[in-house]
C-alpha cells in the first residue's frame, strides 16, 4: 500500500479551514489514513479522517473554528502529517511545514445575481465568502459566460485584476439564455490557486424590440 507515487496537497481558505488531498497510486481503498495538524504558535492540535474521493485519492477538512473566524496569520506555520495505519501501528506517509498564506484557495464566490439585464448586456454582481480581511483589496477574479451551443471549457476567460465584485457583460445576443460563473484568487502566496468556480447563474437577455435589430 505504500509503493505507488504519492502526493499531499493542502490549502487554507484564509479563515478557519485547511482542506487536504492525499493521493497514492496502488494504495488500497480501505486504507485508514488521517491528517494531523500541529501549529507552531497555537494551543490546538487537529486531526481529520481522510475519506476516499476517487480510486486513489482521499480528502479531508481541518475545521479550525467557526467559518468566519480568523484562525491563522501569515506568520503561522502548521506542520501537517499524513498518518496511515499499517497493522497495529501508524506510519507517516508525508509531512510538510504548511504556511497558510503561501497556500491559499478561497471559497467559491456566492450570491450571484443579475443587477440589470438588457437586450445586449447584463450587469451581474457577487460576494466573496469567508475571505480574510487581511487581503484588503488584494484579490483578482476570473469570469466566464456560457453561450448556447458551447461548453464551459470553450468559454473565454475574463480577468478582473482588482477586487471588483460585479461585471457588465456586453455584446450579448437578444432573447438568449446564458450562464455565468466567477472565481477568485488572492495575489498573495507562492502556491496559491484559484477558488472553485461559483455555482452557475442562469439569465436571459431581453428580446429585441419589434422592428429593431
Amino acid at each position: 500500500a505504500v509503493n505507488g507515487t504519492s502526493r499531499f496537497t493542502c490549502f487554507y481558505n484564509s479563515r478557519a479551514n485547511i482542506s487536504c488531498v492525499w493521493s497514492q497510486d496502488g494504495a488500497l481503498q480501505d486504507t485508514s489514513c488521517q491528517v494531523h495538524a500541529w501549529p507552531d504558535r497555537r494551543r490546538w492540535n487537529q486531526t481529520c479522517e481522510l475519506l476516499p474521493v476517487s480510486q486513489a485519492s482521499w480528502a479531508c477538512n481541518l475545521i479550525l473554528g467557526t467559518p468566519d473566524s480568523q484562525k491563522l496569520t501569515a506568520v503561522d506555520i502548521v506542520t501537517l502529517r499524513v498518518m496511515c495505519r499499517e497493522g497495529v501501528r501508524w506510519r507517516m506517509m508525508a509531512i510538510q511545514d504548511f504556511k497558510p498564506f503561501e497556500n491559499l484557495r478561497l471559497m467559491a464566490p456566492i450570491s450571484l445575481q443579475v443587477v440589470h439585464v438588457e437586450t445586449h448586456r447584463c450587469n451581474i454582481s457577487w460576494k466573496i465568502s469567508q475571505a480574510s480581511h487581511y487581503f484588503e483589496r488584494h484579490l483578482e477574479f476570473e469570469a466566464r459566460t456560457l453561450s448556447p451551443g458551447h461548453t464551459w471549457e470553450e468559454a473565454p476567460l475574463m480577468t478582473l485584476k482588482q477586487k471588483q465584485e460585479w461585471i457588465c457583460l456586453e455584446t450579448l445576443t437578444p432573447d438568449t439564455q446564458y450562464e455565468f460563473q466567477v472565481r477568485v484568487k488572492p495575489l498573495q502566496g507562492e502556491f496559491t490557486t484559484w477558488s472553485p468556480w461559483s455555482q452557475p447563474l442562469a439569465f436571459r437577455t431581453k428580446p429585441a424590440a419589434l422592428g429593431k435589430d
Partner: nanobody
Amino acid sequence: QVQLVESGGGLVQPGGSLRLSCAASGFTFSNYAMSWVRQAPGKGLEWVSSITGAGRGTYYAESVKGRFTISRDNDKNTLYLQMNSLKPEDTAVYYCAKYDSSTFYPPTPARGIADRGQGTRVTVSS
C-alpha cells in the same frame, strides 16, 4: 534560477567531524523541504537526510542516524549537515538538494528532489 552551493568538505580522520553548508538562492528557501544526498566512488546516489521547510521535521538514513544532524537557517537561506563520528564508508561527494514542494515523503525520501548543487567532497581516511 535555483542555485545551491555546497561547502565545508575535506579530508578528515575516522571519528572526526565536519560541518557542511549549502547556500541557496533563486527561490523562497523557507517554502521548500531540503535534503542532503551523497554519491560514494563508483556507487549511485544515496539519500542521507531531509528537513521540512521550517525545520520542524528531520529525517535520516539508518546509516547516519545518531551521527549526522541536519538543520537550516531560513534567515540566511542556508542548509547545514553536521557530521560526527565519521567512518570511511561516509566518503562521498555530498549534494544539497531542493524538493519540488514543501512536502517530504518519508517512505520514498528521494521522491520529489528537483534540484541539487555541484557537491562537496568528503574523504574519511587515516
